[in-house]
């Protein structure tokens, strides 16, 4: 029964798998982009690498009504230890510096690929 229970509940996803899935989702977004992503919405830029997942989520959470990034928002929330809601402003953001969502997603993909290569999964 113990063994069967293990099959029934797969347990938490390893961080390396979660990061790879997030990277794959960002690749999908960047490759399948035809019209301007999220109608060219702008998000806060980020100026540090530490605490990046929460900061990235805080930027993207302010983009509403954009189905293309909803999965990314959900996935990022799994990496961020605290609850993030729209309107939050992290010290990691560059004040008064906004960039297009499409560029932000592309930059996030670059950064996550580096983390994956370096084995930094959390």
């Amino acid at each position: 029964l113990t063994c069967l229970g293990g099959f029934a509940s797969p347990g938490p996803v390893p961080p390396s798998t979660a990061l790879r899935e997030l990277i794959e989702e960002l690749v999908n977004i960047t490759q399948n982009q035809k019209a301007p992503l999220c109608n060219g919405s702008m998000v806060w830029s980020i100026n540090l690498t530490a605490g990046m997942y929460c900061a990235a989520l805080e930027s993207l959470i302010n983009v509403s009504g954009c189905s293309a990034i909803e999965k990314t928002q959900r996935m990022l929330s799994g990496f961020c230890p605290h609850k993030v809601s729209a309107g939050q402003f992290s010290s990691l953001h560059v004040r008064d510096t906004k960039i297009e969502v499409a560029q932000f997603v592309k930059d996030l993909l670059l950064h996550l690929k580096k983390l994956f290569r370096e084995g930094q999964f959390n």
């Epitope: 830029s45 980020i46 540090l48 960039i99 297009e100 930059d107 670059l110 580096k114």
Partner: nanobody, 118 residues
Framework: GVQLLESGGGLVQPGGSLRLSCAAS????????MGWARQAPGKGLEWVSI????????YYADSVKGRFTISRDNSKNTLYLQMNSLRAEDTAVYYC???????????WGQGTLVTVSS
Amino acid sequence: GVQLLESGGGLVQPGGSLRLSCAASGFTFAWYDMGWARQAPGKGLEWVSIITDTGGRTYYADSVKGRFTISRDNSKNTLYLQMNSLRAEDTAVYYCATAERDDTFDYWGQGTLVTVSS
């Protein structure tokens, strides 16, 4: 869109110093390895120095080692190149650029001219 704007070039005497700056906008500067490249009159493009995204590692061409120092301020989205003990052969247009292995992430500035002459 993405912009890289160099400044600080000019005319300087041999043995003199200059500090180049590159103001970045339109992308997440803190996540990119960055560098300075140069092109001397009638010559090809040469990488001078590269700095990793966090600033933790730096690389220099042999021709500038010990004379040039690359640095960055991610809070200001700015890249710097401190050039000391300048020589006539350092005369070139200096370009600020992203330095990622994947050319999908390739961005370049317009360049700033450095002339070393007496």
